[in-house]
């Protein structure tokens, strides 16, 4: 049975050539997470693995970095960047446990940052 | 099995810089962070900040964003940290530490570092 | 920046006995990590994501805790445990650690 939940960052909202970091976090299961994904839609921006470290696409090199934790940072943003992003918990034994976070690139400086919100 | 080498100890001048090294073995070095912290008896263990050898992003604490620049060689797996403008609150042993996702599992055996007037 | 408290500051326990020091955070933060150091050397992960023991610590030690209460439980203390602990918070920027529990053999 999966007792896990995902508290993400949540919608979010940046400036355009600015940066954001995405966070999720899993709770509520002792589970050993081993591997962590990060994709935008269907495309995959970087894995961190348990025993091998991060693995950054090579077509998001320039604008992705690792971290903090097992967050993701990205910079350089621009509007194309506007989109669900999702964080993909591969854990033993319970699984695989799926955060959403909704990014919105905006042109204007009026960026604020949404309120946490959980997904079971 | 991992392992990070620091340089040895330094004594400087103040006003002067300093560049310690951190040299990574046994892992591949552009698929971690390697951060590096202070340790001072008064004030325990302070995170200066973390370099992403894998394309050369650096994140600070903003205490240290104007006193410690943070590089990386990959071709010798080397993470390295200078300090400028040394004043003897910068007297302390710094470590670098590997940390990919789950904490920072390795450390180096630290540089001391004293700054004489 | 979250400041991270720890109490008590020094603590001394016979073998045997249980052990259980505390971390204090002033905002909320999703999970902590431990680190143990001894005297002259550098600091060991010792355990991470508030409650996963790092390889090669001892079953007889426990983490636990959320939101801005979080602890270390070592269920029969022996001498080789005496050490500083330090937690570490990275939940918000800048990472901070607290200022450490040093466990005396009694």
């Known amino acids: 049975m999966m007792t896990g939940t995902i508290e993400t960052t949540g919608n979010i909202s940046a400036e355009k050539g600015g940066s954001i970091i995405l966070q999720c976090h899993l709770s509520s299961t002792t589970a050993q997470v081993t591997q962590v994904n990060w994709e935008q839609q269907d495309q995959l921006l970087a894995i961190c693995n348990a025993d091998l470290g991060w693995h950054i696409s090579p077509s998001f090199k320039d604008r992705v970095a690792p971290g903090p934790g097992l967050g993701l940072t990205l910079q350089s943003l621009t509007v194309n960047d506007t989109g669900e992003y999702f964080c993909i918990y591969h854990t033993y034994p319970d699984g695989t446990y799926t955060g959403r976070i909704f990014l919105e690139v905006l042109e204007s400086s009026v960026a604020e940052h949404g309120a946490r919100f959980q997904i079971p | 099995q991992a392992y990070l080498q620091q340089s040895g100890a330094e004594l400087v001048r103040s006003g002067a810089s300093v560049k310690m090294s951190c040299k990574a073995s046994g892992y591949t070095f552009t698929s971690y962070n390697m951060h590096w912290v202070k340790q001072t008896p008064g004030q325990g263990l302070e995170w200066i900040g973390y370099?992403?050898?894998?394309?050369?992003?650096?994140n600070y604490n903003q205490k240290f964003k104007d006193k410690a620049t943070l590089t990386a060689d990959t071709s010798s797996s080397t993470a390295y940290m200078q300090i400028s403008s040394l004043t003897s609150e910068d007297s302390a042993v710094y470590f670098c530490?590997?940390?990919?996702?789950?904490?920072?599992?390795?450390w180096g055996q630290g540089t001391s570092v004293t700054v004489s007037s | 920046q979250i400041v991270l408290t720890q109490s008590p500051a020094i603590m001394s326990a016979s073998p045997g006995e249980k052990v259980t020091m505390t971390c204090s955070a002033s905002?909320?933060?999703?999970?902590m990590h431990w680190y143990q150091q001894k005297s002259g050397t550098s600091p060991k992960r010792w355990i991470y994501?508030?409650?996963k023991l790092a390889s090669g610590v001892p079953a007889r030690f426990s983490g636990s805790g959320s939101g801005t209460s979080y602890s270390l439980t070592l269920s029969s203390m022996e001498a080789e445990d005496a050490a500083t602990y330090y937690c570490q918070q990275w939940s918000s920027n800048p990472s901070t650690f607290g200022v450490g529990t040093k466990l005396e053999l009694k």
């Open positions: 370099i992403y050898p894998g394309n050369g992003y650096t």
């Open positions: 530490a590997r940390e990919g996702g789950w904490a920072m599992d390795y």
């Open positions: 994501d508030t409650s």
């Open positions: 905002s909320s933060v999703s999970q």
